[in-house]
Amino acid sequence: MACLGFQRHKAQLNLATRTWPCTLLFFLLFIPVFCKAMHVAQPAVVLASSRGIASFVCEYASPGKATEVRVTVLRQADSQVTEVCAATYMMGNELTFLDDSICTGTSSGNQVNLTIQGLRAMDTGLYICKVELMYPPPYYLGIGNGTQIYVIDPEPCPDSDFLLWILAAVSSGLFFYSFLLTAVSLSKMLKKRSPLTTGVYVKMPPTEPECEKQFQPYFIPIN
């Protein structure tokens, strides 16, 4: 077999098929893969952001001067391997995933920076980076050990419109409460003072400067 040093888990992922059940994986272990093995490195663990975005670097040890490379992200969960996304790129050019792909990426030499978006808690799993050197021949295949991506769904936030209504209601309530309070206070003050009451202002003589107490004009009611 040409793929010397090809590990067991690599053999089970050699075909670019969308979903492989457990039985097919078992069967593929016994199919010889006639290609050269290539080392692929990727981080062991990555935690997705609260927005469901996970990024990791996939690095491959290119044995030759590849001009065309194909990168595939596979997800392994519950003994099933699913193709998440794939992109073929010419060396020196940008990675181009399909328009509806959840993946984006950039390449730099033998490194591919992959970003997977729209992840949810149910998408937690082992994400495997598969690299194929498509041209020139011979064909080389490398499959990483996988990156365990953990996705934690954020606490469900109330609807923004609902929040707006609550804010409006509270504000209105406070406004009417303060208005009512003011009205009540004014009415009490007015009740204490009879509208027929008359009085005079008596201006008291000014105090000495050294005197600390200051007298202000005050209201004297006249019966």
């Epitope: 077999m1 040409a2 670019a16 006639f34 194929e132 021949p137 011979p138 064909y139």
Partner: antibody, heavy 120, light 107 residues
């Protein structure tokens, strides 16, 4: 059963262009596991690789023919085509379309071939 | 470009004979070699790939060996239906090139 069928063969004038199509049946040309290619064989001579194409449109050509060759794919019709420009008598051959697996650069399925004669 | 040279260019053998065809590469090509059979007026058929792996459906009397620059295709017991021209093809680098062919006939 996978079948490949070439069409468009016949007589082409020197300096003109030959255009051949290969229709794939019994399988999808959009399979990510295969490449599709053209090989030719001049009468009584050996085989010569012309080029390959992937369903996404990526192409590889024989450097000796690269300046004159264009291979294209039409996934909606499940077919791929060959255009060879500025033909001479040396381009007279049976043209085969074929399939190869991604992992291998050998051809496991071949069409029946179509003869192209370059003559005035 | 790497040149592929086949020998002999033609041979004649009796039914049941062991037949050996050689293919030599001008540079080492590891085991990136395939063998094809083309019967008169027919389409080439893949027999062996990766120098020694038999394509499914190919009779076990066909076998391939070799690595680097020297390769052989062996027909352990020649049958009348084996009358054909055999081509080797290297695929370690671009361009893919074929050998000149070896024509096998029955005595």
């Amino acid at each position: 059963q996978l079948q490949l069928q070439e069409s468009g063969g016949g007589v082409v004038r020197p300096g003109g262009s030959l255009r051949l199509s290969c229709t794939v049946s019994g399988g999808s040309i959009s399979s990510s596991s295969y490449y599709w290619g053209w090989i030719r064989q001049p009468p009584g001579k050996g085989l010569e690789w012309i080029g390959n194409i992937y369903y996404s449109g990526n192409t590889y050509y024989n450097p000796s023919l690269k300046s004159r060759v264009t291979i294209s794919v039409d996934t909606s019709k499940n077919q791929f085509s060959l255009k060879l420009s500025s033909v001479t008598a040396a381009d007279t051959a049976v043209y085969y379309c074929a399939r190869r697996r991604i992992q291998l650069w050998s051809f496991d399925y071949w069409g029946q071939g179509t003869l192209v004669t370059v003559s005035s | 470009d790497i040149q592929m040279t086949q020998s002999p260019s033609s041979l004649s053998a009796s039914v049941g004979d062991r037949v050996t065809i050689t293919c030599r590469a001008s540079q080492g090509i590891s085991n990136y070699l395939a063998w094809y059979q083309q019967k008169p007026g027919k389409v080439p058929k893949l027999l062996i790939y990766a120098a020694s792996t038999l394509q499914s459906g190919v009779p076990s009397r066909f076998s391939g060996s070799g690595s680097g620059t020297d390769f052989t295709l062996t027909i352990s017991s020649l049958q009348p239906e084996d009358v054909a021209t055999y081509y080797c093809q290297k695929y370690n680098s671009a361009p893919l090139t074929f050998g000149g062919g070896t024509k096998v006939e029955i005595k």
